[in-house]
């Protein structure tokens, strides 16, 4: 039995932070669970990882240098990421455990989500007119 | 189909201990957490503890804990319950029940038949 | 550990009428709550489950409300099978209790 993870194809990061809504077909409130976030291909990179016990705090951290925080609904795990850089522009895939109560239970892969960095564009100077001609 | 069989009627003194069992078929015995619940004569449902056969997880009500053990015979699919130090408070009807996960909510839609065990002197 | 207060305790109703129990616990449950009902010499029988969703075979009669603190389960034609005991159970975390169980007797 494997939970299903619903992601946006495509989200565009402005001003390089994205909110990105891993939405599963399960109620975690009840759970010890364990939601994360994967960067590339191969998922090598975890990029956030939000930790829920029904009974406590969610322990939102990154191992790997991302600025992050989560935020948990009913059936969804919202990634807040801030501080995007250009070359950060990746394919992004939700995983999701459920630890407790038994049996483990984690989800088919996503589809994922391509998050496209565009960096802080400096607002252009304005053009000042050449030195005047004598 | 989902079924679980438990063991016949049992009639026990004080102090004495008794082990209830329960057999499952028609699923995978080891996927499915088992809950159990008694019943005293007249009275409402009380929920006594569960256990994974899967990995031997078990979570005890506190009110039964150092009293009640649940174990299992995977080689069997069967689940066991004994109560020890048995007082006639403990007359009652024993159940067992699956609990299914509907993506994420829990509920026990299997019991068995139950088995009355009265403590008499 | 989480209280359950199911009222009333016994009921008397007619075939045909519209009956209502209620359960009511001291913490915030969402919607982890269970419904069954017990016939004498029998094991429960689950009716609803996650609060609102009924189980497959269940008459549509049945109906299950609410979420948070505030339960309610609802036979909108009661008939002559429907005369039982009927029990709430929460599965927020253990013990997974169980309400005090409402009778549903005939009139």
């Known amino acids: 039995n494997k939970i299903l993870v619903k992601q946006s194809p495509m989200l565009v990061a402005y001003d390089n932070a994205v909110n990105l809504s891993c939405k599963y077909s399960y109620n975690l409130f009840s759970r010890e669970f364990r939601a994360s976030l994967h960067k590339g291909l191969d998922s090598a990179v975890e990029v956030c990882v939000v930790y829920g016990n029904y009974s406590q705090q969610l322990q939102v951290y990154s191992k790997t240098g991302f600025n992050c925080d989560g935020k948990l609904g009913n059936e969804s795990v919202t990634f807040y990421l801030q501080n995007l850089y250009v070359n950060q522009t990746d394919i992004y895939f939700c995983k999701i455990e459920v630890m407790y109560p038994p049996p483990y239970l984690d989800n088919e892969k996503s589809n994922g989500t391509i998050i496209h960095v565009k960096g802080k564009h400096l607002c252009p100077s304005p053009l000042f007119p050449g030195p005047s001609k004598p | 189909q989902v079924q679980l069989v438990q063991s016949g009627a049992e009639v026990k003194k004080p102090g004495a201990s008794v082990k209830v069992s329960c057999k499952a078929s028609g699923y995978t015995f080891t996927e499915y957490i088992i809950h159990w619940v008694r019943q005293a004569p007249g009275q409402g449902l009380e929920w006594m503890g569960w256990?994974?056969?899967?990995?031997?997880?078990?979570n005890y009500a506190q009110k039964f804990q150092g009293r009640v053990t649940m174990t299992r015979d995977t080689s069997i699919s069967t689940a066991y319950m004994e109560l020890s130090s048995l007082r006639s408070e403990d007359t009652a009807v024993y159940y067992c029940a699956r609990r299914d996960d509907f993506s994420g909510y829990d509920a026990l839609p299997y019991w068995g038949q139950g088995t009355l065990v009265t403590v008499s002197s | 550990d989480i209280q359950m207060t199911q009222s009333p305790s016994s009921l008397s109703a007619s075939v045909g009428d519209r009956v209502t129990i209620t359960c009511r616990t001291n913490e915030n449950i969402y919607s982890n709550l269970a419904w069954y009902q017990q016939k004498p010499g029998k094991a429960p029988k689950l009716l609803i489950y996650a609060a609102t969703h009924l189980v497959e075979g269940v008459p549509s009669r049945f109906s299950g409300s609410g979420s948070g603190t505030d339960f309610t389960l609802t036979i909108s034609s009661l008939q002559p099978e429907d005369f039982a005991t009927y029990y709430c159970?929460?599965?927020?975390?253990?013990?997974?209790?169980f309400g005090g169980g409402t009778k549903v007797e005939i009139k």
């Open positions: 159970q929460h599965f927020w975390g253990t013990p997974c209790t």
């Open positions: 256990f994974y056969p899967g990995s031997n997880d078990i």
